[in-house]
């Protein structure tokens, strides 16, 4: 009955500080409303990075000021986190909640370790 959530173990952000990964869940029920939350775990502290609720079959929409974007297809969510810097390197956990109809289910992935390397500044040219 528990909901299983799968996500990649490691992802490397690109030079523009953007990281993408897939969050896939095995749904025990027929949900029509799903909430996806990205959490960051650092030093046993957990903080919310972004969250979106969507109706199955529709696109998920994050708030305008969110650093996340994403698309959904069936039980799979493609997540992109932008504006990352080296200090943001850490474990990013995908949490999926089947909000409606009852019963409610929650699933938490094992986390994706995102590595972010700040680009070297361009050398001054004379």
């Amino acid at each position: 009955k528990a909901m299983h959530v799968a996500q990649p173990a490691v992802v490397l952000a690109n030079s523009r500080g953007t990281a993408s990964f897939v969050c896939e869940y095995a749904s025990p029920g027929k949900a029509t409303e799903v909430r996806v939350t990205v959490l960051r775990q650092a030093d046993s502290q957990v903080t919310e990075v972004c969250a979106a609720t969507y109706m199955m079959g529709n696109e998920l929409t994050f708030l305008d000021d969110s650093i996340c974007t994403g698309t959904s297809s069936g039980n799979q969510v493609n997540l992109t986190i932008q504006g990352l810097r080296a200090m943001d390197t850490g474990l990013y956990i995908c949490k999926v909640e089947l909000m409606y109809p009852p019963p409610y289910y929650m699933g938490i992935g094992n986390g994706t370790q995102i590595y972010v390397i700040d680009p070297e500044p361009c050398p001054d040219s004379d």
Epitope: K1, A2, M3, H4, P28, E33, T37, L39, V46, T47, E48, A51, K95, M99, Y100, P102, P103, Y104, Y105, M106, G107, I108
Partner: antibody, heavy 118, light 108 residues
């Protein structure tokens, strides 16, 4: 720091109504699902109801379904539990609790006692 | 509904001893969704462990959780005077959210 403060408890006759409140502070209230949990005197914990972060959905325990209504006002950082058709078995301390980011109930209020007696 | 059964009902131990509390689920519960709470008389419950084995903020390392499937354990390695209380397990992976009936850890 996170604080949850319940109020509104008291003694009420069977069949009557009561409304509990829970004032929240110290966190972004509108980002969290919130719960009511009750504890009858000398007994264990019983989950009562949940309301999602935006108030869109609510689930209730079978024992209170159709009699209790859970609502929230995110502009006031406050939860409400409207309890109608109260029964003697509803006598308990009622706690509001925050559904933490990882799912467990990470912060609890101090509780408010509801006694249903004639 | 997932029913959680805790044992023993009461555990009589002395300070400094090790306490082992059991929680058994009526059906499989992912370890990600099992929590333990401590409650002292006249106080609200306090979250100790979430995800079966992760300590909540500020919880001393003498408290540890383990288990998977249907069998979970809370261990207190060396009982301190302030640890004598009632302990509840809870599953929060699906509705309705359910608690065990509690284990009372009392001074022998």
């Amino acid at each position: 720091q996170v604080q949850l403060v319940e109020s509104g408890g008291g003694v009420v006759q069977p069949g009557r109504s009561l409304r509990l409140s829970c004032a929240a502070s110290g966190f972004t209230f509108s980002s969290y699902g919130m719960h009511w949990v009750r504890q009858a005197p000398g007994k264990g914990l019983e989950w009562v109801a949940v309301i999602w972060y935006d108030g869109s959905n609510k689930y209730y325990a079978d024992s209170v379904k159709g009699r209790f209504t859970f609502s929230r006002d995110n502009s006031k950082n406050t939860l409400y539990l409207q309890m109608n058709s109260l029964r003697a078995e509803d006598t308990a301390v009622y706690y509001c609790a925050r559904g933490g980011l990882m799912g467990a109930f990470d912060y609890w209020g101090q509780g408010t006692l509801v006694t249903v007696s004639s | 509904e997932i029913v959680l059964t805790q044992s023993p009902g009461t555990l009589s131990l002395s300070p400094g001893e090790r306490a082992t509390l059991s929680c058994r689920a009526s059906q499989s519960v992912s370890s990600s969704y099992l929590a333990w709470y401590q409650q002292k008389p006249g106080q609200a419950p306090r979250l100790l462990i979430y995800g079966a084995s992760s300590r909540a903020t500020g919880i001393p390392d003498r408290f540890s959780g383990s288990g998977s499937g249907t069998d979970f354990t809370l261990t207190i390695s060396r009982l301190e005077p302030e640890d004598f209380a009632v302990y509840y397990c809870q599953q929060y992976g699906t509705s309705p959210w359910t608690f065990g009936q509690g284990t009372k850890v009392e001074i022998k």
